[in-house]
Structure formats: C-alpha cells, structure tokens
C-alpha cells in the first residue's frame, strides 16, 4: 500500500512542479515522499501543513494536493488546515531545505516511519 502511495506522491509532485513552474534549478524545496506522507514543492519561506495520513487510505488521484500552504503561494486545497488543529504536521521551507516536521509524526499522529515501512 505504501509503494502505491509513494508512486502516486511522485505523480502529484510532477503535476505540482508543472503547475508551479518548478524545475531542478528552482530555489525552494522539492516535493518529497518521507515514508509517511507526501509533501508538495514549496518556495522558501512557505510553511506546508499536512493532515496525519490514514494508514490504509488510498490517495485520491483526482485531488491535486491534500495540503494547505501558508506563504506567498495559494496552492492548496480547501481543508483550511491549521496548526491549532490536532493531527496536523508542518514543515517550513528554508534556504537550507525542509525543516523537521513539527510536531514529530509520533506525537501528532501516534505512529512513525518505522510502522509505515512495514
């Protein structure tokens, strides 16, 4: 199931790159699959929020992204995720790349990457 989510994540990243005009030399943070969930590409200064993944949920391929972005980009969905919600994880896109997730998955979602790799 996670191989399928990873493959769909890579497809979504590719579509997002096209929409946002990202390429390999673009400044910012590339989209990534971190073995738990999918992170969209982001510009430096953006905070990207994701909901804790449902472990056995298949990504909906019709949905371009399932995250909310705070920053200059308005690319996101209508979920209006907020760090004041439970079960929301954020990463900041910095000049040095992606920050660590906050909160850590284990604290925000109750599981970590070791479980989702099995």
């Amino acid at each position: 199931i996670f191989k399928k989510e990873q493959a769909m994540c890579l497809e979504k990243i590719q579509r997002a790159n096209e929409l946002m005009g990202f390429n390999d030399s673009s400044p910012g943070c590339p989209g990534m699959w971190d073995n738990i969930t999918c992170w969209k590409p982001a510009h430096v200064g953006e905070m990207v929020l994701v909901s804790c993944p449902e472990l056995f949920r298949i990504f909906n391929p019709d949905q371009v992204w399932e995250t909310e972005t705070i920053g200059e980009s308005d690319f996101g969905d209508s979920n209006s995720l907020d760090l004041s919600d439970m079960g929301v994880v954020s990463r900041n896109c910095t000049e040095d790349g992606w920050s660590e997730p906050f909160p850590h998955y284990f604290d925000a979602c109750g599981f970590d990457e070791y479980e989702s790799e099995t």
Epitope: L83, D85, M86, D107, A108, G110, D112, Y114, E115, T118
Partner: antibody, heavy 123, light 107 residues
Framework: QVQLQQSGPGLVKPSQTLSLTCAIS??????????WNWIRQSPSRGLEWLGR?????????HYAVSVKSRITINPDTSKSQFSLQLNSVTPEDTAVYYC?????????????WGQGTLVTVSS | DIQMTQSPSSLSASVGDRITITCRAS??????LNWYQQKPGKAPKLLIY???NLQSGIPSRFSGSGSGTDFTLTINSLQPEDFATYFC?????????FGPGTKVDIK
Amino acid sequence: QVQLQQSGPGLVKPSQTLSLTCAISGDSVSSNSATWNWIRQSPSRGLEWLGRTYYRSKWSNHYAVSVKSRITINPDTSKSQFSLQLNSVTPEDTAVYYCARGTWKQLWFLDHWGQGTLVTVSS
Amino acid sequence: DIQMTQSPSSLSASVGDRITITCRASQQIARYLNWYQQKPGKAPKLLIYASYNLQSGIPSRFSGSGSGTDFTLTINSLQPEDFATYFCQQAIIQPYTFGPGTKVDIK
C-alpha cells in the same frame, strides 16, 4: 485491568547506576499500540518525563535531552516488563520514580502508573 | 523545552465549591494537553486528555477547556475526595513537560 508493579533499590550511591524494573500485567510490553514510560518527581524539579520504549515493527526509544547521555530503557519481552537504567547518578537524581503506560487517543497520555519508588542518591 | 505554568499554585476551597485552575504553555500546543490529579503518596491519575476529553471513570464534575496556550480545569461541586494536587502536561513535543501543580486544600 492494567497494572504496573515497580521494583528496585531505594538507595544508590553517587556515580553509580540507578536500576528499576516495571512489571506489566493486563497488557504486554510488546503491544503495538502502547508506549512504556519512566517519569520522576522531586520537590526541586517537579514531574519530569524521562523517556519511553515501544514496539511497532521494531523497538524504539525516546529520551529527554536532560538525561539522554545517561539513560537506557529496555524492554524484557520474556517477562513483559521494562527497566530504567540511569548512569552516573548524583544527589540531584533523588526522586520518586514512576513507570507508566502511554496510550494514544488524539495525543499520547499516561493512563496507568506504577506505585512509585523513592530513590535516594547518597553515600 | 516547552514551559508549563499553572495558577494559582494553591487554593483553599470548601465542599460544593466550583473551582478553576489555569495552565499556560510557553508556545502554541493546540489541544495537546492532559490533566492529572495526584494525592499524597500516590501516583498521578489521568483526568482529562486532549484539553477537554474526560478519561473513562472520571466523574463529570471535572471538565477541561482551552486551545493554543491557555487551558483551564474546572471542578464543579468540589467533593471531599477532590482535595489533591492537579498537574497539566503538554504532549506535543518531547520532552513532555508538566506544570508545577496546583494544590487544592480544604478551607
């Protein structure tokens, strides 16, 4: 009914190792939904979470930075118990030590606790 | 580490009173907050998790509220067995940290 029973010495000399054990009944240390924690309480530091061990597809540990260089929490699956080892103790480590089970419902909380063990560090 | 503060540090009340204890976090913690009760010589006991959810077996006179940095524990119609010390605890970032406690004693 989950119960946690603590055992271990109440007096440890400075520079030595504090060792406590927490025996679990009504649950398993290998549970794939619980975490197994150690917390201590002293008048000077209040309640202080020290760390936890848990099993999912492998064993993992999380430790508080304040004790990370000195602490080890080990599960013992054959006896369904887990232990705390704190090395190089000083009188500041004198406290009541508790083991506790962590349960997840939107967040981690400690829903079952051991009876507590007063450990005094003194020569 | 996230610092947790509680007020008041102690309060005196009578059976039947309604009391409120406040807990404040040094940074936003959403609703990642638990409340515990501790009686002398005993281990802490979970009362409320995730700010307002009552733990199984806890009387409904206990209630919690709050989000972000400010939280409250309310006890309606204080009972003799409620005289104890109450602690809040954040569970958003390790190390999980506790407040210093609020001691509730008999007026």
